[in-house]
């Protein structure tokens, strides 16, 4: 079997839709937020895809510190009790309830910075994060639906004569697989793992003698990757002119 050769093409470099992936933080100055994320101020909840192993910074609503009474971060992770981290300005006290993950911390001391950081992001950090700013004028809050993205490992091999198997292993969410050229493909198989990742497998056959090399293209929110492989000869074939 010939080894597949690889072609990495990060979607971050080519896709405007995925600009949030390139940044670890949505905490920009208000002018930037208004320009780049006009919905952010108006929305209470933000869906935010974050790549695993990167660092993420989540920010509170833009409230002046002098107006603050209490800052509370509420963290709801799947299968765990709700964790709260709070800071009372008047007493300069911080308090935590049911918070066991040491990777989720204040960026610095809450009187300096109310942002929350996840360092680094793990697959278990999928969940809902909400900052509540209590002021004399009422409560202001901003919520994040954090979707942790896991880059799949892509493999390509020829399983038997002119049949290739492309796998996108343990991706989150599931990757999509396409082929150049299109082949005679079995239905795509998906295998779901307990940690929320998915392995996608595509198996295709090329009868055409003139197909020299097949390319498996894997599309994923974390980036695209292509692998290609030269197919073995048609069994029994020795010599041919240009064949169609």
């Amino acid at each position: 079997e010939g080894a597949a050769q690889s072609n990495n093409s990060l979607m971050l470099q080519t896709s405007k839709e995925n600009h949030t992936l390139a940044s670890n933080s949505l905490c920009m100055d208000e002018k930037q937020i208004t320009q780049n994320h006009s919905k952010v101020l108006a929305e209470v909840n933000i869906s935010w895809p974050v790549q695993m192993a990167r660092n993420a910074v989540l920010c509170c609503p833009p409230i002046e510190f002098r107006n603050l009474i209490v800052i509370t971060w509420e963290i709801i992770l799947r299968g765990q009790p709700s964790c709260t981290k709070s800071y009372r300005k008047e007493t300069n006290e911080t308090k935590e309830t049911n918070c066991t993950d040491e990777r989720i911390t204040w960026v610095s001391t809450p009187d300096q910075n109310s942002d929350l950081q996840i360092h680094p992001v793990a697959i278990t950090h999928d969940g809902y994060y909400r900052c509540i700013m209590a002021t004399p004028d009422g409560n202001f809050h901003r919520g994040y639906h954090l979707q942790v993205l896991v880059t799949p490992e892509v493999t390509l091999f020829e399983s038997r004569n002119r049949t290739a198997v492309c796998k996108a292993v343990a991706g989150k969410p599931a990757a999509q697989i396409s082929w150049i050229p299109a082949g005679d493909c079995a239905p795509t198989e998906q295998e779901y793992w307990g940690n929320g990742t998915v392995t996608v497998k595509s198996t295709c056959h090329w009868e055409g003698h003139n197909v020299s090399t097949v390319t498996c293209h894997v599309s994923h929110l974390t980036g695209n990757k292509s692998l290609y492989i030269e197919l073995l000869p048609v069994p029994g074939a020795k010599k041919s002119a240009k064949l169609y």
């Epitope: 079997e1 010939g2 050769q5 690889s6 072609n7 990495n8 093409s9 150049i180 050229p181 299109a182 003698h209 003139n210 197909v211 020299s212 090399t213 097949v214 390319t215 292509s226 290609y228 492989i229 030269e230 073995l232 000869p233 048609v234 074939a237 020795k238 010599k239 041919s240 240009k242 064949l243």
Partner: antibody, heavy 114, light 107 residues
Framework: QVQLVQSGAEVKKPGASVKVSCKAS????????MHWVRQAPGQGLEWMGN????????NYDEKFQGRVTMTADTSTSTVYMELSSLRSEDTAVYYC???????WGRGTLVTVSS | DIQMTQSPSSLSVSVGDRVTITCQAS??????LHWFQQKPGKAPKLLIS???NLEDGVPSRFSGSGSGTEFTFTISSLQPEDAATYYC?????????FGQGTKLEIK
């Protein structure tokens, strides 16, 4: 690292044959197609055909059909390209390449002149 | 056969300028390709494999993009040593076919 070492330059008369060799190292010789490409002076690149050493399977471009023969010797990890009935327009540099075109030999100049 | 239409056939550009070369596959047939640089008397050198993968040791000013039938090769800031002829090669179908080449001169 794949290495492809080609035989030296040849001068041939019209009507004669030439056999160019390409010795491979650094990869599993029988598992990769070997291709031949030529380039006439001042011209572009032209694919001639390929051979799969593991089975001896061959594809020739129809332009060279009947005049070209590609063979492989697995004991020495060498492929050969023989071109017969040479004419002046066959004067070119002949390249062998493998690993889906990512590894090339340095080329062999074949001059056909009376 | 898949014909690869490469354009332009030649261009003369100043150092520091951006250079773009395109290759289009005939018959609307999706393919995969490589981009090569060739200097006089030398074998072609692979710069970009599989449409967009920069080969080891190749300066980052070179890039490739595109998929399906339309592909682009770019030099972001031309250097004097980039004077050469550039070729695309489709390797999806037999026969493999090259573009006609683009001769790049420095003004």
């Amino acid at each position: 690292q794949v290495q492809l070492v080609q035989s030296g330059a040849e001068v041939k008369k019209p009507g004669a044959s030439v056999k160019v060799s390409c010795k491979a190292s650094g990869h599993t010789f029988t598992s990769y197609w070997m291709h031949w490409v030529r380039q006439a002076p001042g011209q572009g690149l032209e694919w001639m055909g390929n051979i799969y050493p593991g089975s001896g399977s061959i594809n020739y471009d129809e332009k060279f059909q009947g005049r070209v023969t590609m063979t492989a010797d697995t004991s020495t990890s060498t492929v050969y390209m023989e071109l017969s009935s040479l004419r002046s327009e066959d004067t070119a540099v002949y390249y062998c390449l493998t690993m889906t075109g990512t590894s090339w030999g340095r080329g062999t100049l074949v001059t056909v002149s009376s | 056969d898949i014909q690869m239409t490469q354009s332009p056939s030649s261009l003369s550009v100043s150092v520091g300028d951006r250079v773009t070369i395109t290759c289009q596959a005939s018959q609307g047939t999706p393919i995969n390709l490589h981009w090569f640089q060739q200097k006089p008397g030398k074998a072609p050198k692979l710069l970009i494999s599989g449409a967009s993968n920069l080969e080891d040791g190749v300066p980052s000013r070179f890039s490739g993009s595109g998929s399906g039938t339309e592909f682009t090769f770019t030099i972001s800031s031309l250097q004097p040593e980039d004077a050469a002829t550039y070729y695309c090669l489709q390797f999806t179908y037999i026969p493999w076919t090259f573009g006609q080449g683009t001769k790049l001169e420095i003004k």
